[in-house]
């Protein structure tokens, strides 16, 4: 059994694709996409957007357990990611594509999610990369919010206003789980797929991938 894609890579399975991972300290399993090509491989993909084929305006339970297809658009699941990152130091890489053919990334040298009792609060340190010098995930980290669980710092309900589950602040500079807008409809969309410190307020991105890997890989 494998805890993450880094373990799979180190076992000699170095082809990108869908693999079965096992929750730490349990027999519960989850299917994930492993990127074995990007930057040395061993990346466990925890989120992917590319075409709007999957609805990301989901409930707390769905974000907790995961949804979508690892071959396409999906969310791996907050509970698995929380358990995985609480017992080991992980880096988070966020890969972004715009509609003009440009790509950028943000790399956080330490990433973990608190447990459900703390609303899967995100913790990040050590930002580098090309998608902005300032973190587009508010610091210090926010609690996770969904349409049926409002944990943000806004009088409004950010998840309702901007759609999707995310670590909203009030409402903050990013939402990679926002409404997917096709090309030519992707500007001036404040509920789109946003990464402010790369593309600004109203720009909705073409594709996003969030992936994690042990810091000592």
């Amino acid at each position: 059994t494998f805890r993450d894609c880094a373990e799979i890579f180190k076992s000699g399975l170095t082809t990108s694709g869908i693999y079965t991972l096992t929750f730490p300290n349990s027999t519960e399993e989850v299917k994930a996409y492993c990127d074995m090509d990007m930057g040395g491989g061993g990346w466990t993909v925890i989120q992917h957007r590319e075409d709007g084929s999957v609805d990301f305006q989901r409930t707390w339970k769905e974000y907790k357990e995961g949804f979508g297809s690892p071959l396409g658009e999906y969310w791996l699941g907050n509970e698995f990611v929380s358990q995985l990152t609480s017992g080991h130091r992980y880096v988070l890489k966020i890969q972004l594509k715009d509609w003009e053919g440009s790509e950028a990334h943000s790399l956080y040298e330490h990433f973990y999610l608190s447990g459900e009792e703390s609303n899967y609060r995100i913790h990040l340190t050590g930002l580098t990369g090309t998608a902005g010098k300032i973190s587009s995930i508010s610091q210090p980290g926010s609690d996770f919010s969904t349409k049926d669980s409002d944990n943000d710092k806004c009088i409004c309900k950010c998840s309702q206003m901007l759609t999707g589950g995310w670590w909203f602040d009030a409402c903050g500079p990013s939402n990679l789980n926002g409404q997917y807008y096709p090309q030519k409809q992707n500007t001036n969309k404040f509920n789109g797929i946003k990464w402010y410190y790369w593309k600004g307020s109203g720009y909705s991105l073409k594709a996003t991938t969030m992936m994690i890997r042990p810091a000592d890989f």
């Epitope: 409004c156 309900k157 903050g172 404040f190 307020s201 109203g202």
Partner: antibody, heavy 121, light 107 residues
């Protein structure tokens, strides 16, 4: 205190252009989006667009697309709105206003005093 | 664009009266509604945002309510300085739009 001071009244001929300025003071200029709203005589308010002084990003009301350009000069904390190919129905008071948030164009908490632009032959 | 239909377009009232202004959105705008007061020759002034939150320094006689498509601004006891025009504004969807205004006049 937080203040937006706009340039003075203008009289323009049809087909001409006008550039209105809005100087901000009392806050960090790049921390908030700026919007432009106009009001024709005796009429309601009409949102024209916004500019993000932090990165120069803009978003325009489709009604004005191609005729309006919004810019900023962060060294002087000034926003500008240029409207081209003026028509008589562009006669209005033009307001700049600050949004309460950098990341979204929410509500407008501070307004300039307005600039009357009259378009007449 | 989302249409914001304000009513009434004008209302005559006396000092001390309770005045209610309504705004109806053409589609769901959650609670993304603000209210502004405008006096002749002056710029609008923010009163209420997120449908019911008073801006700093706004007297407690002003209150807002509503969600979805129906919103209300209430002035509980009209004061002489409240005679003005009031506008609702939705910022849920691009482009932001305003109601046509309600003029509160002295009876």
């Amino acid at each position: 205190q937080v203040q937006l001071v706009q340039s003075g009244a203008e009289v323009k001929k049809p087909g001409a252009s006008v550039k209105v300025s809005c100087k901000a003071s009392g806050y960090s200029f790049t921390d908030y989006n700026m919007v432009w709203v106009r009001q024709a005589p005796g009429q309601g308010l009409e949102w024209m667009g916004y500019i993000d002084p932090y990165n120069g990003g803009t978003g325009y009301n489709q009604k004005f697309e191609g005729r309006v350009t919004m810019t900023t000069d962060t060294s002087t904390s000034t926003a500008y709105m240029e409207l081209r190919s003026l028509r008589s129905d562009d006669t209005a008071v033009y307001y700049c206003a600050r949004t309460r948030d950098r990341y979204d164009v929410w509500y407008f908490d501070v307004w300039g005093q307005g600039t009357l632009v009259t378009v007449s032959s | 664009d989302i249409q914001m239909t304000q009513s009434p377009s004008s209302v005559s009232a006396s000092v001390g009266d309770r005045v209610t202004i309504t705004c109806k959105a053409s589609q769901d705008v959650y609670i993304a509604v603000a209210w502004y007061q405008q006096k002749p020759g002056k710029a609008p002034k923010l009163l209420i945002y997120w449908a019911s939150t008073r801006d700093t320094g706004v007297p407690s006689r002003f209150s807002g309510s509503g969600s979805g498509t129906d919103f209300t601004l209430t002035i509980s006891s009209l004061q002489p300085e409240d005679f003005a025009t009031y506008y609702c504004h939705q910022y849920s969807s691009y482009p932001p739009t305003f109601g046509g205004g309600t003029k509160v006049e002295i009876k």
